[in-house]
C-alpha cells in the first residue's frame, strides 16, 4: 500500500510530490540569507533570525510556530580584555603573543560582532609554565606519555592538536593528567588537504584560521546549572562550583602560524613515533619545556572569558497529523553559529527551511501527514546542545509517550564525495529503500540511484552490496532524544572521501572562513548535494510520518545486537585468566540476543499478516515498534553518566563524537588490567553483563504477542 492511503488524499500528494517540490535554488537562497551576519547563541542577531524563521514557517503553512525560550549558561570572551597566549622570557617580558582575531575573509572586513576564537566555558586564569606536546590528547596519548615515556604533565601547560576526538575529551584528559592549562591548535596534517589552496582561494585552513568550540564534559546534561530540568523562569540554578561539566583549567585555541612559534622551540623527549608528527616544520618534541637556548622561556596564558546566564530561543513548528496527531516525528537542527555558519549549521538550516516549505505547499493543497510533524530550529547547540536538551527536558513526558522518531539536520555537507548516515538499526531498511528511489548527484553515476553510488563509495564492512551506516554517537542535537529518551533517531549528510582525506572534519570548521562563498564556490556550486540531503532527510520524515505501518525493522536490531555481543565478548577474552578466575560468562547476554532474534523474527511475520484495516491492531503493532527503542533505556543510566540511559549505545567515554556499543560493559573492561582492585573491577564487568542481558531480554519481550 502506498503511504498516502492513510489520509484519503489524491494520488498527487504522495512522497514524489513532496520530493519534487524541493528545489536546489531555494536552498541556495536560504543559505545566503542565513549567513550574512554572525548568529552566535544568546545574541540579538540570533533572536532576530529566530523571529524571521518563525514568521517564514507560518507563511509556509505550518499550523503553529512558537518560540520556546530558556535562560542557560553561555560563555563569551571579554570584549575589553582579550584572550591570548605569550612566550615570556626569564624577566617575565612577553616576547611573542598569539593573534587576537582571525583576519576577516574578503567582503567581511566591516562585519561587526565576529566573536574572536575562544574555548567556550574556559575558566579565567593566567597560568605560566613549561609546555608539553600531547599529540591529540586522547586517552591513548596520555597513556603513551605517562606510562611509556614517564613524562609527567602535572603543573604543565599542554598543547594538543585538534582532531580525532571531541575537544572536551582532550581537556578532560589534560585535567586528569594534572595540567594547568591547555592550548588547542589546528595542525595542517589534519586541516590542510594536499593540493588544495587556503581560503579564499580554496577550502583549506589558512595559518591564521582558528577552530572555536565548547570544551564541556556535560554527558548529556544540557544547561550546566539545571541538569535534568528545563532552565525556565522558575528554575533553581546550581552555584557555578556545582555546575555540570565545566573545565577547571584555562583553555585557548590557536591557528598553525601561532602553533609553529610555540612548537618550534620545544625540547625534551623526541616524539615516540611518526603518528605524533604533524605537517609543520617543527621537531614535534614532547618536552617538557623549550630546548637549550630557550630553556628559560615559559608559556603564559591570558584567559578572561566569562560565563553568563543568557536567554536562548528555539523555534518549534507544528504540522498536525490527520490520523494520529498524538504521534510525533521530529525534524530538528540548530540555528546558532560560531560566526557565519556557512556549513555549520546553516547548510542544514537551509535544507530544513526548504523541507518545511515543501510540506507547507502540500498542506495548502489539502494534504496532511498521518502523524504530527514537529520542526525545530534549536539554539545554543554550539554551547553544549542546550536548546534541544532544555526543550526535551521541558517536554519529556510528551516525548517519551508520543515520540516516533527524531531526524537531525545540522550541516548538510562536510564534503561532496558520498552520503553518510548514522542511525538506529530500526531505520536501516527505511534508509536503504529511500536511497534506492533517489537519484545520485555524483559524477559518473548519472541515471543511477543514490543507493548505488553510496554503496560503491562507502561499502559496508560487514555486508557486501550494502552501504556503511554508522552508530549514533553525540556532539549534536539528537543526543537527548536518542541517548536519554530512547526515541529512534537518525542523521544524514554528504561527506568527504575518508580514504584519501585524513584531516578531521572539514578544514574550515568553526572558523570565520566558514562562509556562504565557501559552499557556493568550492563545495556545492549547483547545490545538488544539498538537494540530495534534503531529499534524504525530508524523505525519511515523510515516510515516518505518513506510512501506515511504521518503517522500522526490528530484525536489523537483532543482527547488530549479535555483532555487538560478539565484539564485547572478544574484548573481554583478551583477559582469559581473569575471566576464569572471576567466573565471567557472557552466556546470559548471548542467550538474550538469541531470544531477541527469535521474537523479532516472529513479530516481523505477524507484521506482514495482520489486518491493517483494524485501527486498534494497527496502533498496537505500531506502538510496539515505536516503543522498542524506548525499551533499551535503563532509567538509572550508565555509571556516572545518568543522562546517557541507552544500554546498547552511548557516546564513547573517550570521544563524545563516537558511538560505543554496550557502553556499560565496554567502560567496565577498559584498562581493566591497571585497576587496583581486580576483584571489584571484574565484579563490575559481571554487573554490566547482567544489566545488558536483562535489558535485551526485556526489550525482546516488548515484541512478544501482547496476550
Amino acid at each position: 500500500k502506498s503511504s498516502n492511503e492513510a489520509t484519503n488524499i489524491t494520488p498527487k500528494h504522495n512522497m514524489k510530490a513532496f520530493l519534487d517540490e524541493l528545489k536546489a535554488e531555494n536552498i541556495k537562497k536560504f543559505l545566503y540569507n542565513f549567513t550574512q551576519i554572525p548568529h552566535l547563541a544568546g545574541t540579538e542577531q540570533n533572536f532576530q533570525l529566530a523571529k524571521q524563521i518563525q514568521s517564514q514557517w507560518k507563511e509556509f503553512g505550518l499550523d503553529s510556530v512558537e518560540l520556546a525560550h530558556y535562560d542557560v549558561l553561555l560563555s563569551y570572551p571579554n570584549k575589553t580584555h582579550p584572550n591570548y597566549i605569550s612566550i615570556i622570557n626569564e624577566d617575565g617580558n612577553e616576547i611573542f603573543n598569539t593573534s587576537l582575531f582571525e583576519p576577516p575573509p574578503p567582503g567581511y572586513e566591516n562585519v561587526s560582532d565576529i566573536v574572536p576564537p575562544f574555548s567556550a566555558f574556559s575558566p579565567q586564569g593566567m597560568p605560566e609554565g613549561d609546555l608539553v606536546y600531547v599529540n591529540y590528547a586522547r586517552t591513548e596519548d596520555f597513556f603513551k606519555l605517562e606510562r611509556d615515556m614517564k613524562i609527567n604533565c602535572s603543573g604543565k601547560i599542554v598543547i594538543a592538536r585538534y582532531g580525532k576526538v571531541f575537544r572536551g575529551n582532550k581537556v578532560k584528559n589534560a585535567q586528569l593528567a594534572g595540567a594547568k592549562g591547555v592550548i588547542l591548535y589546528s595542525d595542517p596534517a589534519d586541516y590542510f588537504a594536499p593540493g588544495v589552496k587556503s581560503y579564499p582561494d580554496g577550502w583549506n585552513l589558512p595559518g591564521g584560521g582558528v577552530q572555536r568550540g565548547n570544551i564541556l564534559n556535560l554527558n548529556g546534561a544540557g544547561d550546566p546549572l539545571t541538569p535534568g530540568y528545563p532552565a525556565n523562569e522558575y528554575a533553581y540554578r546550581r552555584g557555578i562550583a556545582e555546575a555540570v561539566g565545566l573545565p577547571s583549567i584555562p583553555v585557548h585555541p590557536i591557528g598553525y602560524y601561532d602553533a609553529q612559534k610555540l612548537l618550534e622551540k620545544m625540547g625534551g623527549s623526541a616524539p615516540p613515533d611518526s603518528s605524533w608528527r604533524g605537517s609543520l616544520k617543527v621537531p614535534y618534541n614532547v618536552g617538557p619545556g623549550f630546548t637549550g637556548n630557550f630553556s628559560t622561556q615559559k608559556v603564559k596564558m591570558h584567559i578572561h572569558s566569562t560565563n553568563e546566564v543568557t536567554r536562548i530561543y528555539n523555534v518549534i513548528g507544528t504540522l498536525r497529523g490527520a490520523v494520529e496527531p498524538d504521534r510525533y516525528v521530529i525534524l530538528g537542527g540548530h540555528r546558532d553559529s560560531w560566526v557565519f555558519g556557512g556549513i555549520d549549521p546553516q547548510s542544514g538550516a537551509a535544507v530544513v527551511h526548504e523541507i518545511v516549505r515543501s510540506f507547507g505547499t502540500l498542506k495548502k493543497e489539502g494534504w496532511r501527514p498521518r502523524r504530527t510533524i514537529l520542526f525545530a530550529s534549536w539554539d545554543a547547540e554550539e554551547f553544549g546542545l542546550l536548546g534541544s536538551t532544555e526543550w526535551a527536558e521541558e517536554n519529556s513526558r510528551l516525548l517519551q509517550e508520543r515520540g516516533v522518531a527524531y531526524i537531525n539536520a545540522d550541516s548538510s555537507i562536510e564534503g561532496n564525495y558520498t552520503l553518510r548516515v548514522d542511525c538506529t538499526p530500526l531505520m536501516y531498511s527505511l534508509v536503504h529503500n529511500l536511497t534506492k528511489e533517489l537519484k545520485s548527484p555524483d559524477e559518473g553515476f548519472e541515471g543511477k540511484s543514490l543507493y548505488e553510488s553510496w554503496t560503491k563509495k562507502s561499502p559496508s564492512p560487514e555486508f557486501s552490496g550494502m552501504p556503511r551506516i554508522s552508530k549514533l554517537g553525540s556532539g549534536n542535537d539528537f543526543e537527548v532524544f536518542f541517548q536519554r529518551l530512547g526515541i529512534a533517531s537518525g542523521r544524514a549528510r554528504y561527506t568527504k572521501n575518508w580514504e584519501t582525506n585524513k584531516f578531521s572534519g572539514y578544514p574550515l570548521y568553526h572558523s570565520v572562513y566558514e562562509t556562504y562563498e565557501l559552499v557556493e564556490k568550492f563545495y556545492d556550486p549547483m547545490f545538488k548535494y544539498h538537494l540530495t540531503v534534503a531529499q534524504v532527510r525530508g524523505g525519511m520524515v515523510f515516510e515516518l510520518a505518513n506510512s501506515i505501518v511504521l518503517p522500522f525493522d526490528c530484525r536489523d536490531y537483532a543482527v547488530v545486537l549479535r555483532k555487538y555481543a560478539d565484539k564485547i565478548y572478544s574484548i573481554s577474552m583478551k583477559h582469559p585468566q581473569e575471566m576464569k578466575t572471576y567466573s565471567v560468562s557472557f552466556d546470559s547476554l548471548f542467550s538474550a540476543v538469541k531470544n531477541f532474534t527469535e521474537i523479532a523474527s516472529k513479530f516481523s511475520e505477524r507484521l506482514q499478516d495482520f489486518d491493517k484495516s483494524n485501527p486498534i491492531v494497527l496502533r498496537m503493532m505500531n506502538d510496539q515498534l515505536m516503543f522498542l527503542e524506548r525499551a533499551f533505556i535503563d532509567p538509572l543510566g550508565l555509571p556516572d553518566r545518568p543522562f546517557y540511559r541507552h544500554v546498547i549505545y552511548a557516546p564513547s567515554s573517550h570521544n563524545k563524537y563516537a558511538g560505543e556499543s554496550f557502553p556499560g560493559i565496554y567502560d567496565a573492561l577498559f584498562d581493566i588490567e591497571s585497576k587496583v582492585d581486580p576483584s571489584k573491577a571484574w565484579g563490575e564487568v559481571k554487573r554490566q553483563i547482567y544489566v545488558a542481558a536483562f535489558t535485551v531480554q526485556a526489550a525482546a519481550e516488548t515484541l512478544s504477542e501482547v496476550a
Epitope: 565478548y569 582469559p576 585468566q577 576464569k580 560468562s585 557472557f586 552466556d587 548471548f590
Partner: nanobody
Framework: QLQLQESGPGLVKPSETLSLTCTVS????????YYWGWIRQPPGKGLEWI?????????YYNPSLQSRVTISVDTSKNQFSLKLSSVTAADTAVYNC????????????RGQGTLVTVSS
C-alpha cells in the same frame, strides 16, 4: 577422554602466514556448549587469546589481532585451523589449541602446544 593435538610448521618467515591445525579426538567438535580456540604464550610473557570458533563456524577474534587472523572449522574431520598472516618476530610463541565453555574463558582441555618461531 578428549584430546587436542596441534600440527604445523615450527618455523615461519617474517611477512608470511602461520598455519596450524588442531585435531580433536575422543569427542565431537559439533557441540553447541563449547567453543574451540587458539591461545599463545610468547617467551617470557603471559597467555594471549587469539580467537575461537563454534561448530557452526561462527568466529570470535582478539581485536588486536583481528585483521590478521582467520579461524575455520571442519566438522567432518573433527579439526579446526588457525591462519595468522603477515607475521613478525613478535608472533614467536608456543601456540595451543583449546576447548572452552561457550561465552566464557573456561578452558578445560588444551593441546600440548607447539613452538612457532618467526625468523628468516
Amino acid at each position: 577422554q578428549l584430546q587436542l593435538q596441534e600440527s604445523g610448521p615450527g618455523l615461519v618467515k617474517p611477512s608470511e602466514t602461520l598455519s596450524l591445525t588442531c585435531t580433536v579426538s575422543g569427542g565431537s567438535i559439533s557441540s553447541s556448549s563449547y567453543y574451540w580456540g587458539w591461545i599463545r604464550q610468547p617467551p617470557g610473557k603471559g597467555l594471549e587469546w587469539i580467537g575461537s570458533i563454534d561448530y557452526s563456524g561462527y568466529t570470535y577474534y582478539n581485536p588486536s589481532l583481528q585483521s590478521r587472523v582467520t579461524i575455520s572449522v571442519d566438522t567432518s574431520k573433527n579439526q579446526f585451523s588457525l591462519k595468522l598472516s603477515s607475521v613478525t618476530a613478535a608472533d614467536t610463541a608456543v601456540y595451543n589449541c583449546a576447548r572452552h565453555k561457550a561465552a566464557t574463558a573456561d578452558f578445560d582441555y588444551r593441546g600440548q602446544g607447539t613452538l612457532v618461531t618467526v625468523s628468516s
